[in-house]
């Protein structure tokens, strides 16, 4: 027996059924992605990481979201202290709030 | 679309200095980091380093550790790279390159010639 | 460092052979690697990331396997366009380290 067609990469299993006029065929087929990679076509890679590159873990469809105190495309700016000025602070560590010279305070406003 | 345009070319003595431009267009430039890779005539290619043009934080290859510095000015979306102590093995074309998962865009290169 | 051995070194095959480069590495990279195509006096173009992902526009008769240490490429019908030199480079950790790269000619 052999089946022709297109299956997605899911978690499910998919029930073929065939007649082939001498026998009758059930069987249950999956395709799963290899390790990291997400999306019908398994093109989608996502690994989670927490170094220079990014601090990102993966949600089901391959998507990085970032650890808590991170954002941005990679995940690799540090999100400053809640108040920290945009104009005259910034942060390399989450939940910081370094000062511009000539300025001070907790929020270097 | 995505562009990275680099310096001229540069001729060089033993022991001078060269600095590389790379200006880049077409995406926001804070968003990727800058790659800088070399290529000897004949040779293949060597990862120098990367930048991270958000912060301007940069890791260096140990090889040339304490010989180059790579720098950004986000108000230009410009990346540098500047290499000292120049000998005759640095010549190469200079690369500057742009991404987190391999480099889909490349800047045309530039000649760096080291000659007494 | 991340040592990355690719073999051959060079390669002579016709139009229509299929064709194959590897690259080793020294330690794990999961699926951190990378496949470039080079032509003289040309930058490098990038043909395949993650070890298996096609880059958008590169023609599908190349492919690339592999994770951990062991990484393929693989040309299924040489066109005369792909005359050329293929370089791996792994981007898992610092330094990005490339193979020496293979020369692929016309026999």
């Known amino acids: 027996a052999s089946h022709s067609g297109m299956i997605n990469p899911s978690r499910q299993w998919q029930t073929l059924k065939q007649n082939t006029g001498v026998a009758h065929f059930e069987y249950q087929i999956r395709v799963t992605c290899d390790d990291y990679y997400y999306g019908f076509g398994c093109n989608k890679f996502c690994r989670p990481r927490d170094d220079f590159f990014g601090h990102y873990a993966c949600d089901q469809n391959g998507n990085k979201t970032c650890m808590e105190g991170w954002m941005g495309p990679e995940c690799n700016r540090a999100i400053c202290r809640q108040g920290c000025s945009p104009k005259h602070g910034s942060c390399k560590l989450p939940g910081d709030c370094r000062c511009q010279y000539g300025w001070q305070g907790l929020y270097c406003d | 679309q995505v562009q990275l345009v680099q310096s001229g070319a540069e001729v060089k003595k033993p022991g001078a200095s060269v600095k590389v431009s790379c200006k880049a267009s077409g995406y926001t430039f804070t968003d990727y980091a800058i790659h800088w890779v070399r290529q000897a005539p004949g040779q293949g290619l060597e990862w120098m380093g990367i930048?991270?043009?958000?912060?301007?934080?940069?890791k260096y290859a140990q090889k040339f550790q304490g010989r180059v510095t790579m720098t950004v000015d986000t108000s230009t979306s410009t990346a540098y790279m500047e290499l000292s102590s120049l000998r005759s093995e640095d010549t190469a074309v200079y690369y500057c390159?742009?991404?987190?998962?391999?480099?889909?865009?490349w800047g045309q290169g530039t000649l760096v010639t080291v000659s007494s | 460092d991340i040592q990355m051995t690719q073999s051959p070194s060079s390669l002579s095959a016709s139009v229509g052979d299929r064709v194959t480069i590897t690259c080793r590495t020294s330690?794990?990279?999961?699926?951190?690697l990378t496949w470039y195509q080079q032509k003289p006096g040309k930058a490098p173009k990038l043909l395949i990331y993650?070890?298996?992902i096609l880059d958008s526009g590169v023609p599908s008769r190349f492919s690339g396997s592999g994770s951990g240490t062991d990484f393929t490429l693989t040309i299924s019908s040489l066109q005369p366009e792909d005359f050329a030199t293929y370089y791996c480079q792994h981007h898992y950790d610092i330094p990005w380290t490339f193979g020496g790269g293979t020369k692929l000619e016309i026999k």
């Open positions: 930048i991270n043009t958000y912060y301007g934080d940069s």
């Open positions: 390159a742009r991404g987190y998962d391999g480099f889909a865009y």
């Open positions: 330690e794990n990279i999961y699926s951190y």
């Open positions: 993650h070890a298996k």
